[in-house]
């Protein structure tokens, strides 16, 4: 949990208790089960990607 | 440039208990994982935990959990994993190395690795 | 546990001519976000473990272009265009979408 009185992190980053800091949710392509990718939104939509030729 | 340089060799009896060392430099510390890494003689790579050094939180494979103690010191950039009751089974080459968590993926560092022997 | 199995478990390999190895994963190590968390090592004789390619098909800082990966989901193959002298060791895949980290058993390339 975040300390209380603490700043609740910016848009986009989510509190790590592993790491006692906000971390960038884009991090989680690097490591999707570090303990922060838990509070961070639904992932990013998927690149486009066309279904035939 | 990142480095891990692991303590030496180690021979001990069995029931002992061995604390092996990693220390890091030409990072910050505290900003990355440091996972533990078994290889027995011949064998294969077993992973057998990690920790976030700037709060000490630890993870641990079922199969180490109790046999292996993850620690590390802030201000000496060092890792340690203490082995505790030995047995010959024991015996392997065990691997410190640094795990991002970042966006922009730059690759897992290893130290040496630190051969240790139980034998009576 | 994720179970990553490899294969060959040894390779003889004649230097200039290409290489391949095969590896699965018990569940797909494709993520939501489209990345596959497959991950390939060299542990040269004597050395340890250094990085080839990550999350799949991602070469590693200084790994030469003739290493490649390929696949996705529960199947993958590290490929070596042309296989140099120095390009013995054992070759590992492990995964990294959750905890444990776990590896295969090893390919073992050799020249031979």
């Known amino acids: 949990e975040q300390a209380p009185g603490t700043a609740p992190c910016s848009r986009g980053s989510s509190w790590s208790a592993d790491l006692d800091k906000c971390m960038d949710c884009a991090s989680c392509r690097a490591r999707p089960h570090s303990d922060f990718c838990l509070g961070c939104a639904a992932a990013p939509p998927a690149p486009f990607r066309l279904l035939w030729p | 440039q990142v480095q891990l340089v692991q303590s030496g060799a180690e021979v001990k009896k069995p029931g002992a208990s061995v604390k092996v060392s990693c220390k890091a430099s030409?990072?910050?510390?505290?900003?990355?994982?440091i996972a533990w890494v078994k290889q027995a003689p011949g064998q294969g790579l077993e992973w057998i935990g990690e920790?976030?050094?700037?709060?000490?939180?630890?993870y641990y494979s079922e199969k180490f959990r109790g046999k292996a103690t993850l620690t590390a010191d802030t201000s000496t950039s060092t890792a340690y994993m203490e082995l505790s009751s030995l047995r010959s089974e024991d015996t392997a080459v065990y691997f410190c190395?640094?795990?991002?968590?970042?966006?922009?993926?730059?690759?897992?560092?290893w130290g040496q690795g630190t051969l240790v022997t139980v034998s009576s | 546990d994720i179970v990553m199995t490899q294969s060959p478990l040894s390779l003889p390999v004649t230097p200039g001519e290409p290489a391949s190895i095969s590896c699965r994963s018990s569940?797909?190590?494709?993520?939501?976000?489209?990345?596959?968390?497959l991950y390939w090592y060299l542990q040269k004789p004597g050395q340890s473990p250094q990085l080839l390619i990550y999350?799949?098909?991602n070469r590693a800082s200084g790994v030469p272009d003739r290493f490649s990966g390929s696949g996705s989901g529960t199947d993958f193959t590290l490929k070596i265009s042309r296989v140099e002298a120095e390009d013995v060791g054992v070759y590992y895949c492990?995964?990294?979408?959750?905890?444990?980290?776990?590896f295969g058993q090893g390919t073992k390339v050799e020249i031979k």
């Open positions: 492990a995964h990294n979408l959750e905890l444990p980290w776990t």
């Open positions: 569940q797909s190590l494709l993520h939501s976000n489209w990345i596959n968390y």
């Open positions: 999350q799949g098909s």
């Open positions: 190395a640094r795990r991002t968590i970042y966006y922009d993926y730059d690759g897992d560092y």
């Open positions: 920790i976030y050094p700037g709060t000490g939180r630890t």
């Open positions: 030409g990072y910050t510390f505290t900003d990355f994982i």
